[in-house]
Interface confidence: low
């Protein structure tokens, strides 16, 4: 399985990572959650520059998620609707995060406790959406590399949303379920 | 990266039937929709039918008695078996894999049938 | 089924210029989830098609800005402000809402 991200740096305020929010519950494909220009929600099906988000933790186990490309923060209105906000609104927008013991993580709205679906695509009948959450596997997503002065090499950061932050144990074996074969 | 690679026969008898492969690589037939699509000079571009991830098919009504979609997760191939040719059958096929809101997104190299004794 | 008309058959440009295309469905495509699934593909000589826009405005990956879609119901326009030369060739448009899918019958966009 993938290293989920239950790091304890993740569970205080602050806290930064870069993400895309895979998931396999979706009825038709796979997907990642994706923050539109025009403040829809959608599902990609593969990695593109509208699914990489920020996540932010805002207090133990609450995050905030921020589209990167868009600078929009993913909202819930209280019947469930999912829309990309330019400003962010505490209750609207802010979701607790569930880490599952498989690497998945369930969010639910802090204000409503609603589960964060994304919004159905067209199965049919017969290809159902699951019941229950929907559960989210959280890939890293690299920030943008900043140009380094010739013959100088950086250190790699920490990666905080790891449970080796560090790199003491070696490279994650984990793949996600899209390369799955 | 993504791939679809078909393979098949170029030349098909008349009243015979046509078989492609569409082996897929980069992604897993567990999560996604592959489609197959055929363009000719006369009818343009024409949707024959799909399978979705959980194996269960969708197929265009006039080509529905004639026409089986199935696929092997494990091997990552989709098979497409078509009946009963006839000279305007003669085509380029495509399979094409879905996207989560739209259709086409990568599709395979197209096998140019031709449909002649 | 679904046919989808497509207007004009042929389009002359010269580079630089605004281009918009026509497609008209015989019935609502709506799909019973609320979206209208209707995308626009561009194909080049032998190349398989390229998707440009899908559910009516939204711009694929990579698609440059100057394409937008439009339209509701039954009417659908696609618009390229300034055309260039790697935008000629076949353009169609194609409803994924209702079995069997249908494309239009396509628009040859091309030098005058």
């Known amino acids: 399985h993938p290293i989920p991200d239950s790091s304890p740096l993740l569970q205080f305020g602050g806290q930064v990572r870069q993400r895309y929010l895979y998931t396999d519950d979706a009825q038709q494909t796979e997907a990642h959650l994706e923050i539109r220009e025009d403040g829809t929600v959608g599902g990609a099906a593969d990695q593109s520059p509208e699914s990489l988000l920020q996540l932010k933790a805002l207090k133990p186990g609450v995050i905030q998620i921020l589209g990167v490309k868009t600078s929009r923060f993913l909202c819930q209105r209280p019947d469930g609707a999912l829309y990309g906000s330019l400003h962010f609104d505490p209750e609207a927008c802010s979701f607790r995060e569930l880490l599952l013991e498989d690497g998945y993580n369930v969010y639910q709205s802090e204000a409503h406790g609603l589960p964060l679906h994304l919004p159905g695509n067209k199965s049919p009948h017969r290809d159902p959406a699951p019941r229950g959450p929907a559960r989210f596997l959280p890939l890293p997503g690299l920030p943008p590399a900043l140009p380094e002065p010739p013959g100088i090499l950086a250190p790699q950061p920490p990666d905080v949303g790891s449970s080796d932050p560090l790199s003491m144990v070696g490279p994650s074996q984990g793949r996600s379920p899209s390369y799955a074969s | 990266q993504v791939q679809l690679i078909q393979s098949g026969p170029g030349l098909v008898q008349p009243s015979q039937s046509l078989s492609i492969t569409c082996t897929v690589s980069g992604f897993s037939l567990t999560g996604y929709a592959i489609h197959w699509v055929r363009q000719s000079p006369g009818k343009g571009l024409e949707w024959l039918g799909m399978i979705w991830k959980s194996g269960n098919t969708d197929y265009n009504a006039a080509f529905m008695s004639r026409l089986s979609i199935t696929k092997d997760n494990s091997k990552s191939q989709v098979f497409f078996k078509m009946n009963s040719l006839q000279a305007d059958d003669t085509a380029i096929y495509y399979c094409a894999r879905n996207g989560y809101d739209y259709e086409f997104v990568y599709w395979g190299q197209g096998t140019l049938v031709t449909v002649s004794s | 089924d679904v046919l989808m008309t497509q207007t004009p058959l042929s389009l002359p440009v010269s580079l630089g210029d605004q281009a918009s295309i026509s497609c008209r469905s015989s019935?609502?495509?709506?799909?019973?989830?609320?979206?209208?699934?209707l995308e626009w593909y561009l194909q080049k000589p032998g190349q398989s098609p390229k998707l440009l826009i899908y559910?009516?405005?939204n711009r694929f990956s990579g698609v440059p800005d100057r394409f937008s879609g439009s339209g509701s119901g039954t009417d659908f326009t696609l618009k390229i402000s300034r055309v260039e030369a790697e935008d000629l060739g076949v353009y169609y448009c194609?409803?994924?809402?209702?079995?069997?899918?249908?494309f239009g019958g396509g628009t040859k966009v091309e030098i005058k």
């Open positions: 559910k009516i405005s």
């Open positions: 019935q609502i495509i709506v799909h019973n989830n609320g979206d209208t699934y």
């Open positions: 194609f409803q994924g809402s209702h079995v069997p899918y249908t």
